[in-house]
C-alpha cells in the first residue's frame, strides 16, 4: 500500500485546512492509527491529533478545538484532518504517521500554505474608517482642549472681576471722604442758599468717553447681562474720571490747603440757576485750575 | 519551576483499588497530557496511558485498558489514575510525566512515583 | 506494538572511557522530518531524566557527552568521556504511535 497526500495545501486565512492523508492498500489491510504532527518546528514534532481505530481522535491539548475529521461519510483508511481557521502562524510543514496492520507504518508530509487575501473595496472601507476615527479622536481632543481654555478663562475673568470690585469699592471709599468734606468746607467757606448738595452737578461719569464697556459677543467671557462685563481699565478710567471732575485732591493730608483754595476759586466762576451751576460768563468758557486739571 | 507533586505510597489488598493523584504546577496544565508510566521492580518502564486535561480524553496501552482510569480535575490542577482489581503483579511504582512542550513527543517532566504494593 | 531491544543489558567502562549503548527498533520510527526515538538516565530511587529527544536532540542541561545517533530502527546512545556520576540504567523510548513504548534498560557500571 501507498499513502495519498499533496505536497502543498494552500487556504485562505480564515478558512479551514483539509490535511489530506489517505492510505491506499491492499484488500484485507485495516488502519490502526494515523498521527499528525507539525514538524518545521525548532523543538521537535508537535503533535496536532491521533486518529485511533479503536479510540477515535483525539486531539493534542496544544490544538484543542482547532482539528476535525472530515465531515461523513467516512473510509476507516481516511486519515485527513481538518485544521480549523487556519491563521498564518499554522503555515509550515506537517506529516501524517500511518500505522497499519499487517503492512507496518508509513508516513508523509506536506506543506500548508496561509494565503491573507486583501479585498480592496474592504480595505479603502478599512482607511474610511480609520480616517472617521482619527477625526473623532482628533476632534475629541480639541473639545477638551477648548473647555480647558474656557474654564481657564472664566476662573480668569472672575479673579479679574473680583480684583476690579475691590478697586472700585476702595476708590469709591475714598471719593465718598473726598465728596463729604469738599461739601463740608463748601457750606463753611460759603453759607449761600443758592448752594447745592454735590447731586445737583450735572456732570455724570457714564457719559465720559472713558466709560469703555465690554461688548464682547463671547458668552462664556461674560457672566453678567451684556453691557455690565467691565473691563478691569475701564473700571479704574471711570474712578479717575470721577475722581478728577468732582475733586482733583482726592482728599490726600497733604494737598487739603491746596484744595480749598481750589474750591473757593472755583465757586467764583460759577453761578446757580434753576438748581443748577452754571459757568459765569467768561471768555473762553474754560476754567483750568492751578494744578492743570480741566473741569 | 514545572513541578509534578504525587500523592503517598500506598499498601493494598488483592481485589481493591487504589486512586494515585499527581498535582500539576508551574505551567498550564490544560496545555499539555499527562501521561502514566509503570515501573516493576527491578524491571523496565511500560507505558499506561495519557489523558488531555482540556476535555478527559484519554488513550490506553491496551494492556491497561480494563486495569487502569485516566482522571483530571481542572480546578485543582491534578491528575489521576485509579487501579482497579489490583494482584500483586501490580506492585510497582507509578509515574506521572509530561511532555518538553504543548504536544510534542518524549517525557521531560516526572512526578517523583508513587508506590503501590499489593499484599494480603 | 513497536518494541524496542536494548543491547547490552549491562555495561562496564572505565572513567574517561566511551560508553555505546545500541536500541534497535521492530520498525522504522523516522519520517523526513525527525525519528521519534528517546533517551533517558535513571538512577535508582529517582525518575527517569530525558537526555535525548528525536534520535540527536540533547535537552536542555544535559552535558555535551552525551550524543545520539541513527535512523530508521538503529539508534545509538554514546557517552564520552564516561564519569562517575553517569552510573544508571539507561533507556530508549519511541513515540511513533501509541502505545509508547521502552526497551528493557541498560545498566552502565564504572570499572
Known amino acids: 500500500g501507498e499513502l495519498e497526500t499533496s505536497d502543498v495545501v494552500t487556504v485562505v486565512l480564515g478558512q479551514d485546512a483539509k490535511l489530506p492523508c489517505f492510505y491506499r492498500g491492499d484488500s484485507g489491510e485495516q488502519v490502526g492509527q494515523v498521527a499528525w504532527a507539525r514538524v518545521d518546528a525548532g523543538e521537535g514534532a508537535q503533535e496536532l491529533a491521533l486518529l485511533h481505530s479503536k479510540y477515535g481522535l483525539h486531539v493534542s491539548p496544544a490544538y484543542e478545538g482547532r482539528v476535525e475529521q472530515p465531515p461523513p461519510p467516512r473510509n476507516p483508511l481516511d486519515g485527513s484532518v481538518l485544521l480549523r481557521n487556519a491563521v498564518q502562524a499554522d503555515e509550515g510543514e506537517y506529516e501524517c504517521r500511518v500505522s497499519t496492520f499487517p503492512a507496518g507504518s508509513f508516513q508523509a508530509r506536506l506543506r500548508l500554505r496561509v494565503l491573507v487575501v486583501l479585498d480592496p473595496q474592504e480595505d479603502s472601507g478599512k482607511q474610511v474608517d480609520l480616517v472617521s476615527a482619527s477625526v473623532v479622536v482628533v476632534g475629541v481632543i480639541a473639545a477638551l482642549l477648548f473647555c480647558l481654555l474656557v474654564v481657564v478663562v472664566v476662573l480668569m475673568s472672575r479673579y479679574h472681576r473680583r480684583k476690579a470690585q475691590q478697586m472700585t469699592q476702595k476708590y469709591e471709599e475714598e471719593l465718598t471722604l473726598t465728596r463729604e468734606n469738599s461739601i463740608r468746607r463748601l457750606h463753611s467757606h460759603h453759607t449761600d442758599p443758592r448752594s447745592q448738595p454735590e447731586e445737583s452737578v450735572g456732570l455724570r461719569a457714564e457719559g465720559h468717553p472713558d466709560s469703555l464697556k465690554d461688548n464682547s459677543s463671547c458668552s462664556v467671557m461674560s457672566e453678567e447681562p451684556e453691557g455690565r462685563s467691565y473691563s478691569t481699565l475701564t473700571t479704574v478710567r471711570e474712578i479717575e474720571t470721577q475722581t478728577e471732575l468732582l475733586s482733583p485732591g482726592s482728599g490726600r493730608a497733604e494737598e487739603e490747603e491746596d484744595q480749598d483754595e481750589g474750591i473757593k476759586q472755583a465757586m467764583n466762576h460759577f453761578v446757580q440757576e434753576n438748581g443748577t451751576l452754571r459757568a459765569k460768563p467768561t471768555g473762553n468758557g474754560i476754567y483750568i485750575n492751578g494744578r492743570g486739571h480741566l473741569v | 519551576e514545572v513541578q509534578l507533586q504525587q500523592s503517598g505510597p500506598d499498601l493494598v489488598k488483592p481485589g481493591a483499588s487504589v486512586k494515585i493523584s499527581c498535582k500539576a504546577s508551574?505551567?498550564?496544565?490544560?496545555?499539555?497530557?499527562m501521561h502514566w508510566v509503570k515501573q516493576s521492580h527491578g524491571k523496565s518502564l511500560e507505558w499506561i496511558g495519557r489523558v488531555n486535561p482540556n476535555n478527559g480524553g484519554s488513550s490506553y496501552n491496551q494492556k491497561f485498558k480494563d486495569k487502569a482510569i485516566l482522571t483530571v480535575d481542572k480546578s485543582s490542577t491534578t491528575a489521576y489514575m485509579e487501579l482497579r482489581s489490583l494482584t500483586s503483579e501490580d506492585s510497582a511504582v507509578y509515574y506521572c510525566a509530561r511532555d518538553p512542550l504543548g504536544g510534542s513527543y518524549g517525557f521531560a517532566y516526572w512526578g517523583q512515583g508513587t508506590l503501590v504494593t499489593v499484599s494480603a | 506494538d513497536i518494541v524496542l531491544t536494548q543491547s547490552p543489558a549491562s555495561l562496564a567502562v572505565s572513567l574517561g572511557q566511551r560508553a555505546t549503548i545500541s536500541c534497535r527498533a521492530s520498525q522504522s520510527v523516522t519520517t523526513s522530518s525527525y525519528s521519534y526515538m528517546h533517551w533517558y538516565q535513571q538512577k535508582p530511587g529517582q525518575p527517569p531524566k530525558l537526555l535525548i529527544k528525536y534520535a540527536s536532540n540533547l535537552e536542555s542541561g544535559v552535558p555535551a557527552r552525551f550524543s545520539g545517533s541513527g535512523s530508521g530502527t538503529d539508534f545509538t546512545l554514546n557517552i564520552h568521556p564516561v564519569e562517575e556520576e553517569d552510573t544508571a540504567t539507561y533507556y530508549c523510548?519511541?513515540?511513533?504511535?501509541?502505545?509508547?513504548?521502552f526497551g528493557g534498560g541498560t545498566k552502565l557500571e564504572m570499572k
Open positions: 523510548q519511541h513515540s511513533w504511535e501509541i502505545p509508547y513504548t
Open positions: 508551574g505551567y498550564s496544565f490544560t496545555g499539555h497530557y
